[in-house]
């Protein structure tokens, strides 16, 4: 399936969202770090990323939690993470990114 991510709220800085099961959703910031953000940003053509926590403002699905990338992956889909939609989070805990 086509792997898509987007930044909401700005061009290179904002809430991190992923597309799954034909719907956009957010990522919980549990364990969200710069390695995860770098992989996310790499999917958008940037070379590096910085993790933002409690970015907030999201709605709908929280698709990912406990994302754990090494930082070398080309896609979040290749990283260790909970199964899609399996989380213990609320939207106050939405992850963000700043890409460069």
């Amino acid at each position: 399936s086509f792997q898509r991510v987007r930044i909401m709220g700005g061009t290179n800085r904002g809430r991190a969202e992923v597309y799954y099961n034909n719907e956009w959703g957010t990522i919980c910031d549990d364990d969200w770090d710069n390695n995860d953000a770098t992989v996310f940003c790499r999917m958008l053509g940037y070379s590096r990323g910085r993790a933002l926590s409690s970015y907030g403002g999201g709605s709908g699905n929280i698709w990912l939690d406990n994302v754990n990338c090494r930082g070398t992956e080309n896609s979040l889909w290749d990283c260790s993470k909970n199964s899609w939609g399996n989380h213990n989070c609320v939207h106050n805990e939405d992850a963000g990114v700043e890409c460069s």
């Epitope: 933002l52 926590s53 409690s54």
Partner: antibody, heavy 120, light 107 residues
């Protein structure tokens, strides 16, 4: 407008302890990362500690690691810095600063600072 | 640690002029850089973050540019309230580090 008010500073002897407080108001304290930054007399700014909005992550500069502890009480809108084994080089103005978001981020609001003097 | 080298340390200018302050990082920090303003009896103010994004409330006469290791803060058409001390700060890696500051004085 965001308000951050530090307290707890003073003159202490080397080797002693001190606990700084920073009371926050006019924003939802529990949603934001918080930092301590210091400035020694005639020296530059030095970031020393960060705590995430939920206290799950804490980071320290090497110069204070193992001696200083950052903590927060979201129910009291208060940030703390417990300082042990104080040294003369810890003499500085200590500022608390709010992060733009819930964790590691730029410092978008600062307090006026509180002075800590370590001297015998 | 990432060393931030700011220049000049002192800068004298007149209202209405334009000035630029340089900040160089000892390694590439992408665009993860902020600029702050320090004034007596006031709390420090975030002016610019992410290298070039103006913080809410920052006048448009301020601008930031650069990426990697070289960054610049430019203030155009200086106003009397702009005379202050300016610091750059990297937010790429721990520990977050600041430049030594630039004091902008009235000529």
């Amino acid at each position: 407008e965001v308000q951050l008010v530090e307290s707890g500073g003073g003159l202490v002897q080397p080797g002693s302890s001190l606990k700084l407080s920073c009371v926050a108001s006019k924003f939802t304290f529990s949603n934001y990362g918080m930092n301590w930054i210091r400035q020694a007399p005639k020296k530059g700014l030095e970031w020393i500690a960060l705590i995430y909005y939920n206290s799950n992550n804490k980071y320290y500069a090497d110069s204070v690691k193992g001696r200083f502890t950052i903590s927060r009480d979201n129910s009291k809108n208060t940030l703390y810095l417990e300082m042990n084994s104080l040294r003369s080089e810890d003499t500085a103005m200590y500022y608390c600063a709010k992060s733009l978001t819930g964790g590691s981020d730029y410092f978008d609001s600062w307090g006026q600072g509180v002075m800590v003097t370590v001297s015998s | 640690d990432v060393q931030m080298t700011q220049s000049p340390s002192y800068l004298a200018a007149s209202p209405g002029e334009s000035v630029s302050i340089s900040c160089k990082a000892s390694k590439s920090i992408g665009t993860f850089l902020a600029w702050y303003q320090e004034k007596p009896e006031k709390t420090n103010k975030l002016l610019i973050y992410s290298g070039s994004t103006l913080q809410s409330g920052t006048p448009s006469r301020f601008s930031g540019s650069g990426s990697g290791t070289d960054f610049t803060l430019t203030i155009r058409n200086l106003e009397p309230e702009d005379f202050a001390v300016y610091y750059c700060q990297q937010h790429d890696e721990y520990p977050f580090t600041f430049g030594s500051g630039t004091k902008l004085e009235i000529k």
